[in-house]
Amino acid sequence: APGPVPRSVSLPLTLKELIEELSNITQDQTPLCNGSMVWSVDLAAGGFCVALDSLTNISNCNAIYRTQRILHGLCNRKAPTTVSSLPDTKIEVAHFITKLLSYTKQLFRHGPF
């Protein structure tokens, strides 16, 4: 589709894809991943890699499979790192996805790419 059309293609396009996927997930009214809990991470500090680490602990949840795959592409580190979590804080996946959506929208809009 011609609009929005990122000029610097790969990263903006991937962020756009992630935003659309997360937006799609938040529309679903059924409990996401059976109400599973994940570590609440500092996205501003750790970015997509810590988001991926947090969501990696969830298995057998088809709803977030595509999100995990996109995050894999956005996280370009070589080796796994420890999750930068807020001490002992877990939140529902649905809440995590909402936070991740806000973070991704902000990055998509304000760059830099």
Partner: antibody, heavy 123, light 106 residues
């Protein structure tokens, strides 16, 4: 401050006639943003007409104007143009120039608008 | 082409009222929707983009929500300046505007 100023309309044009609308931009890095034209017929709603990418290498048109209108830009002069040919009565409208919100996109929300220039097509 | 349908077409309200305008898309536009305010004889003004993000300088009484095919613009407490026409716009594929909702004084 960020400003857009349209010109080129104002008079009466015969059906089948042509016009070149211009939009002068100031207050932002013009060459980094996509630009668009949106029109509004008297007493009616907004209608997107055409968009052009920051570099000018991609252009998009509404079906209603495809083949008749041509959008272009001059990044050295901070100008965007709309060449309107084969004008019809239903092209009568105020034509607004608008700036894309984000410099990464073409065809975005429009965060800055000009005041518009009036095109009247009548015999 | 993606069509946008706004409802209601006209809305009569008083200062202080909570006002909600709906925009429905003929197919999913994800969250790529913006809302504009237009006063007579003036250019449109961007209020909300990406479905729910408030444009800089726009009062917090304006809010947007929704994704997919249904979106809403809410004015939490209508002010005298808010009597105007409001348009939604989708920018997922090219660009399309809704037909507008006129908010008038009751």
């Amino acid at each position: 401050q960020v400003q857009l100023q349209e010109s080129g309309g104002g008079g009466l044009v015969q059906p089948g006639g042509s016009l070149r609308l211009s939009c002068a931009a100031s207050g932002f890095t013009f060459s980094s943003y996509g630009m668009s034209w949106v029109r509004q017929a008297p007493g009616k709603g907004l209608e997107w007409v055409s968009s052009i990418s920051a570099s000018g290498d991609s252009t998009f048109y509404a079906d209603s104007v495809k083949g008749r209108f041509t959008i272009s830009r001059d990044n050295n002069k901070n100008m965007v143009f709309l060449q309107v040919n084969s004008l019809r009565a239903d092209d009568t409208a105020v034509y607004f120039c608008a700036k894309d919100w984000s410099q990464w996109l073409v065809g975005d929300a429009f965060d800055v608008w000009g005041r518009g220039t009036t095109v009247t097509v009548s015999s | 082409d993606i069509q946008l349908t706004q409802s209601p077409s006209t809305l009569s309200a008083s200062v202080g009222d909570r006002v909600t305008i709906t925009c429905r898309a003929s197919q999913s536009v994800s969250l790529w929707v913006a809302w504009y305010q237009q006063r007579p004889g003036k250019a449109p003004k961007l209020l909300i983009y990406d479905g729910s993000t408030l444009q800089s300088g726009v009062p917090a009484r304006f809010s947007g929500s929704g994704s997919g095919t249904e979106f809403t613009l809410t004015i939490s407490s209508l002010q005298p300046d808010d009597f105007a026409t409001y348009y939604c716009q989708q920018y997922k594929t090219f660009s399309t505007f809704g037909q507008g909702t006129k908010v008038e004084i009751k």
